[in-house]
Interface confidence: low
């Protein structure tokens, strides 16, 4: 199985993809976890919601978060705050009950910012992982790119914000013109403030990013 | 159903080596970590290493390091550990486990090791 | 000494409740998942909690397990006589390199 070597910046995030056949993977979470030495087992760094179907929502782990698409077929892994005790052997796995499947193998590198010389041993920020849990053996193969689409939930904001505005112009082009009947209700439209806050927070889960 | 089933009792003098195996079935052994861990008499767990049955690939801790190793026969699913340079205070049960997604999910029934003059 | 710490011993009428404590350091369980492991008199250890609170398949609900910091617990409800046995918390120790197990806490069912 190919490792894809990725790098990033102190401080910055790092967003790395892993496509899967989601027909294959139909049902499956997905997790990401850190190899412990090149034989040791996998430490779980983060998993998708417990729920399958609800695998879309955000899950995370100190820094690291977690999404899936399950019908595209990418699971989205972000490290934020990235710092140089970060960079190590990653793999996404399909988890399919006790068992794991090794989707991709990832190198995280942690590129030091040249301005930055805060000693790289301060820099180590400890993720809640389980380091018992080792990957199964076992290997397949699978797709790997790179995706950077905007997630969901910014698409669905700026497209409450756009439909408000636009409502907001139409009411005030229709007061303008005198056709506003007194007494007769203004259109609310979409509740951005309420609405898309909510769906936000749905997509981030309860913990939100 | 998952089973490991390991080698009887054992008594060994001080300076020998002894040799535990570990029988797995009921899953794909070269599919799981197998860690050994040994329990001394009315002491507590103490995790010796662990072993990639696929690969080969060992980690061991520190306090055994050069005096264990641990290897498998992938034709008979089986996990060995063996222990050189015995000392009386080696005398313990050891116990093979087996690690997938979920930690030491099954273990061995336990060989008792007696390190005795 | 054990790199977790475990009281020795705790006791509890049958139906009563019980919990056991496990203290490491961020280096530990600050750092990882905490499982828990019931070893019955003269039996290997069985797997009770993963992931800090989760149950494999047969273990009844009766066991639950918690973690907080660099301490974890394990919480016992509705005690039998058949929960008498000795309690292992483990996890990894990154510092160490290495799985760690605390001491054992000896369950008695009065």
């Known amino acids: 199985l190919n490792t894809t070597v990725l790098q990033g910046m102190a401080g910055q995030s790092l967003r790395v993809s892993c496509t899967y056949d989601a027909l294959k993977h139909w049902g499956r979470r997905k997790a990401w976890c850190r190899q412990l030495g090149e034989e040791g087992p996998c430490q779980r760094v983060v998993s998708t919601h417990g729920v399958w179907l609800l695998a879309f929502l955000k899950k995370r782990n100190g820094s690291t978060v977690i999404a899936d698409d399950t019908l595209a077929g990418t699971v989205t892994i972000t490290l934020k705050n990235l710092q140089a005790g970060d960079a190590g052997l990653y793999q996404c796995q399909s988890l399919r009950g006790r068992e794991a499947e090794v989707l991709q193998k990832v190198l995280v590198e942690v590129l030091e910012d040249p301005l930055d010389d805060q000693d790289a041993g301060d820099l180590w920020v400890p993720e809640e992982s389980s380091s018992f849990e080792g990957a199964q053996v076992e290997h397949s193969t699978s797709r790997n790119q790179e995706t950077s689409f905007p997630p969901t939930s910014i698409l669905l904001l700026l497209a409450c914000v756009l439909l408000s505005k636009f409502l907001a112009a139409s009411i005030l082009w229709a007061v303008a013109r005198g056709r506003q009947k007194p007494g007769t209700p203004v259109v609310r439209g979409l509740d951005c403030g309420q609405d898309a806050g909510h769906q936000l927070q749905i997509l981030t889960g309860p913990g939100g990013t | 159903q998952v089973q490991l089933v390991q080698s009887r009792a054992e008594v060994k003098k001080p300076g020998a080596s002894v040799k535990v195996s570990c029988k797995a079935s009921g899953y794909t052994f070269t599919g799981y970590y197998m860690h050994w861990v040994r329990q001394a008499p009315g002491q507590g767990l103490e995790w010796m290493g662990w072993f990639n049955p696929n690969s080969g690939g060992t980690k061991y801790a520190q306090k055994f390091q050069g005096r264990v190793t641990m290897t498998r026969d992938t034709s008979i699913n089986t996990a060995y550990m063996e222990l050189s340079s015995l000392r009386s205070d080696d005398t313990a049960v050891y116990y093979c486990a087996r690690t997938g997604v979920i930690p030491f999910d099954y273990w061995g029934q336990g060989t008792l090791v007696t390190v005795s003059s | 000494q054990s790199v977790l710490t475990q009281p020795p011993s705790v006791s509890a009428a049958p139906g009563q409740k019980v919990t056991i404590s496990c203290s490491g350091s961020?280096?530990?369980?600050?750092?990882?998942?905490v499982s828990w492991y019931q070893q019955l008199p003269e039996t290997a250890p069985k797997l009770l909690i993963y992931d800090n609170n989760k149950r494999p398949s047969g273990i009844p609900d009766r066991f639950s397990g918690s973690k907080s910091g660099t301490s974890a617990t394990l919480g016992i409800t509705g005690l039998q006589t058949g929960d008498e046995a000795d309690y292992y918390c483990?996890?990894?120790?990154?510092?160490?390199?290495?799985?760690?197990f605390g001491g054992g806490t000896k369950l008695t069912v009065l």
């Open positions: 483990g996890t990894w120790d990154s510092s160490l390199s290495a799985v760690v």
């Open positions: 961020s280096s530990n369980i600050g750092n990882d998942y």
